[in-house]
Interface confidence: low
Amino acid sequence: SNNSFTNFKLATELPAWSKLQKIYESQGKTLSVKQEFQKDAKRFEKLNKTFTNYDGSKILFDYSKNLVNDEIIAALIELAKEANVTGLRDAMFKGEHINSTEDRAVYHVALRNRANKPMYVDGVNVAPEVDSVLKHMKEFSEQVRSGEWKGYTGKKITDVVNIGIGGSDLGPVMVTEALKHYAGVLDVHFVSNIDGTHIAETLKVVDPETTLFLIASKTFTTAETITNANTAKNWFLSKTGNDPSHIAKHFAALSTNETEVAKFGIDTKNMFGFESWVGGRYSVWSAIGLSVALYIGYDNFEAFLKGAEAVDNHFTQTPLEDNIPLLGGLLSVWYNNFFGAQTHLVAPFDQYLHRFPAYLQQLSMESNGKSVTRGNVFTDYSTGSILFGEPATNAQHSFFQLVHQGTKLIPSDFILAAQSHNPIENKLHQKMLASNFFAQAEALMVGKDEEQVKAEGATGGLVPHKVFSGNRPTTSILAQKITPATLGALIAYYEHVTFTEGAIWNINSFDQWGVELGKVLAKVIGKELDNSSTISTHDASTNGLINQFKEWM
């Protein structure tokens, strides 16, 4: 049955849900965080959790500025117990087919099992296979980085172009940007969009003699990726005397489809596989991360995996009350379903993390943008937050206005590393950045009332414009430094937050049927763009747009 992992259809059936509704009505919606701090001197002590990574580095998660008290936290934990979040978690870590609609295991956690403990899917221990792919990645990345691997004219590789989309692009893009400080000898470029501009601009800046193309597609049939890959291949051949034998030195595949890879002309020795139990948005830990290993070096890539593994260990072994990702997920449910919040802001106070919100956007929204439960009924509650974000302090000069004084409740995560990789001007920049990190969370919580505004000299009609309601929730995440291990841990934290939300909402966080319909219709329309006839097969709007496009193209 599709519902073999949970014994409830809707989260609203759970007794703790009703209890939380009542708590929200009686105290949640009027709870003042400022007053909670005044009432409880130990509030910060109780509501901050420190995660210790495998290398001893630490990340502090401060939940104390959230709209909760002891009773609310207890009721949320009760909800997690009733929804059997830990049961589903354990099923995932045992390799059971918790992706029920596609009848697949969800085993990205096995990719970072650097302890090499046995991890089974359908009776097979996958740890040796994962290890052998990583060994292949290590060997290959070290050959390329050292210059031992040479292009067809005997020159060292200087540039890597990763061609992929979705999970085969966003993860590596984000991670290589985040860990730029650890980059070595190679430059990496990423081509994802089918818009010809993306590949055209990239090919302008690389040299065919010193460029390695990675074609990243699980099935090796993704329309955008294969189209871009063929364009890259044609460009390469046109620049290298049209000799297909040169392809072997300049193209590698990150895929599971050996037949299509060989057909494309790539030597299958340069093919890095991964299994059907790795979902695209969870694939940066797999062979899809080869561009990362090439860029920052294999040892750093392994540290990245180990950081995630350390969070996996925390998530599976820590009691619910202190379980950091679980608490993060429960808070998200609290705001989504009881306060009616529809968004979740992630603002990294770190320029290196500028693609982190975009990565989390796919992780969260593709996972939990569902409206049917594991019990095959429509939800009677909101799911899937709209996740957005930009690096601060830039964000403070754009959408923070709405966060502070708008009509919507926007639960926010702020992320900062105490140590900068670039402590320039005697740490002046870092101190300014940090002061904003602390000040924004404080301002959102304390606000500014009418009396303060008047005391500062405002009068008349200007007063309400300068009032800040405060009581706007934030979670502050303070790391020591953004290292590969820290980044791995942060991603895994958000993966398990997403997992917790999905488990409580009783939805399948691991399929993505929503991407299918548009793909199918695009194929149909693609054929219609190949001829000059007037189109009348769609609705009036679609017909009108297609016909205007054809006229202008």
Partner: nanobody
Framework: QVQLVESGGGLVQPGGSLRLSCAAS????????MGWYRQAPGKEREFVAG???????DYADSVKGRFTISRDNAKNTVYLQMNSLKPEDTAVYYC?????????????WGKGTQVTVSS
């Protein structure tokens, strides 16, 4: 837009019964949460009972065991059977429809029906 029309209110003696109905102007099959709220003079509107499309029901502690909510999707109607009425049940009773899933964000209220419990 969905119009909600409540009926069935009136004057009743303590210990008596009433059955409130709320008719929606369109199908309620996918509109998952339908509920009753009430507002007594000088007080805030409070939750009384709710019923989801998944078949689960929920009640305020003060009415548990006395009130029963039910819905008839075929008739686009939700009912509130009120037994053992007490003077403190006197209020205007409002029907609420909250859409989720594909209809998330829809939230409609009826105009209310007066219930007075008095001897």
């Amino acid at each position: 837009q969905v119009q909600l029309v409540e009926s069935g209110g009136g004057l009743v003696q303590p210990g008596g019964s009433l059955r409130l109905s709320c008719a929606a102007s369109r199908s309620i099959v996918t509109i998952n949460v339908m509920g009753w709220y009430r507002q007594a003079p000088g007080k805030e509107r409070e939750f009384v009972a709710g019923a989801t499309s998944g078949g689960s029901t929920d009640y305020a502690d003060s009415v548990k065991g006395r009130f029963t909510i039910s819905r008839d999707n075929a008739k686009n109607t939700v009912y509130l059977q009120m037994n053992s009425l007490k003077p403190e049940d006197t209020a205007v009773y409002y029907c609420n429809l909250r859409g989720t899933g594909y209809n998330y964000g829809e939230n409609y209220w009826g105009k209310g029906t007066q219930v007075t419990v008095s001897s």
